[in-house]
């Protein structure tokens, strides 16, 4: 692969459908602008979950309607995905691009298998 990207192999979402994991990349140089994308792979189909571009030293900013939030510290990005349900169980791949200054470097993680278990409905109380 090109740039090395590390992420945990498995994460279990909370009962509220929230999953967090760290995506860490080994930067060849001193990038000032970084783009992080979370991709979901299921049945050989890859879809984009969310993406954010940030300047080193600044916070990640996802779109307002994004299901992702995150913080960055050096070459490490802490990602949180919300609103997950059992059907969202799958492999979540972290893609990191060093956008500026040139040259462009790309790295793809091996993916984090996120397991989501829908909570049991509360029993009716008499």
């Amino acid at each position: 692969k090109a740039m090395h990207v590390a992420q945990p192999a498995v994460v279990l979402a909370s009962s509220r459908g929230i999953a967090s994991f760290v995506c860490e990349y080994a930067s060849p140089g001193k990038a000032t602008e970084v783009r992080v994308t979370v991709l979901r792979q299921a049945d050989s189909q890859v879809t984009e979950v969310c993406a954010a571009t940030y300047m080193m030293g600044n916070e990640l900013t996802f779109l307002d309607d994004s299901i992702c939030t995150g913080t960055s510290s050096g070459n490490q990005v802490n990602l949180t995905i919300q609103g997950l349900r059992a059907m969202d169980t799958g492999l979540y791949i972290c893609k990191v691009e060093l956008m500026y200054p040139p040259p462009y470097y790309l790295g793809i993680g091996n993916g984090t298998q996120i397991y989501v278990i829908d909570p049991e409905p509360c029993p009716d109380s008499d």
């Epitope: 692969k1 090395h4 893609k95 040259p103 470097y105 790309l106 793809i108």
Partner: antibody, heavy 115, light 107 residues
């Protein structure tokens, strides 16, 4: 201004050796992965070799067509990258470019392998 | 290894035409694709990096699109100075293979 200047090309006999050099300036050389790419007469671009930098332990990668015959190296103190070419074949004839991870390119140096 | 299938191999179009060149990869390269322009006697010039991003100093006539295994370079309005050979390249992983090239001429 970014500059990559290749040298060392010329006429070489089949089976012979040649060493290409590429001197870089205008950017932080040690932050970059360096590559050699060639273009044979009437052919397309062919990636040959890559050397990564210190954070990547100077890992090297080669195309199948040159693996075992060509060696890429670098000297960060001299802002230079090299391509040692051994057991040259007539099909190695072409213009050789050095490039800083494909963003910046040199002007190229012509290597002709012929008897 | 990732195989790059570029088409067409040559193309003739008129000034002002919209021109598209495609590149298909043998497996998903996650947008790790660059496009280059090479004019005779000149070094290759990076046009598009990461499938969609315009390189510094490149005319906005050029744009890139695509994901997965299918990618496109578009010239919105062909100009005489665009006569060149265009190449795609996989930059996801070694070997960093190039497409076979598209030679673009003016009618």
């Amino acid at each position: 201004e970014v500059q990559l200047v290749e040298s060392g090309g010329g006429l070489v006999q089949p089976g012979g050796s040649s060493r290409l050099s590429c001197a870089a300036s205008g950017f932080t050389f040690s932050d970059n992965w360096m590559n050699w790419v060639r273009q044979a007469p009437g052919k397309g671009l062919e990636w040959l070799a890559q050397i990564r930098n210190k954070p990547y332990n100077y890992e090297t990668y080669y195309s199948a067509s040159v693996k075992g015959r060509f060696t890429i190296s670098r000297d960060d103190s001299k802002n230079s990258v090299y391509l040692q070419m051994n057991s040259l074949k007539t099909e190695d004839t072409g213009v050789y470019y050095c490039t800083a991870q494909f963003a910046y390119w040199g002007q190229g140096t012509l290597v002709t392998v012929s008897s | 290894d990732i195989q790059m299938t570029q088409s067409p191999s040559s193309l003739s179009a008129s000034v002002g035409d919209r021109v598209t060149i495609t590149c298909r990869t043998s497996e998903n390269i996650y947008g790790g694709l660059n496009w280059y322009q090479r004019k005779p006697g000149k070094s290759p010039k990076l046009l598009i990096y990461g499938a969609t991003n315009l390189a510094s100093g490149v005319s906005s006539r050029f744009s890139g699109s695509g994901s997965g295994t299918d990618y496109t370079l578009t010239i919105s309005s062909l100009q005489p100075e665009d006569v060149a050979t265009y190449y795609c390249q996989n930059v996801l992983r070694s070997p960093f293979t190039f497409g076979s090239g598209t030679k673009l001429e003016i009618k």
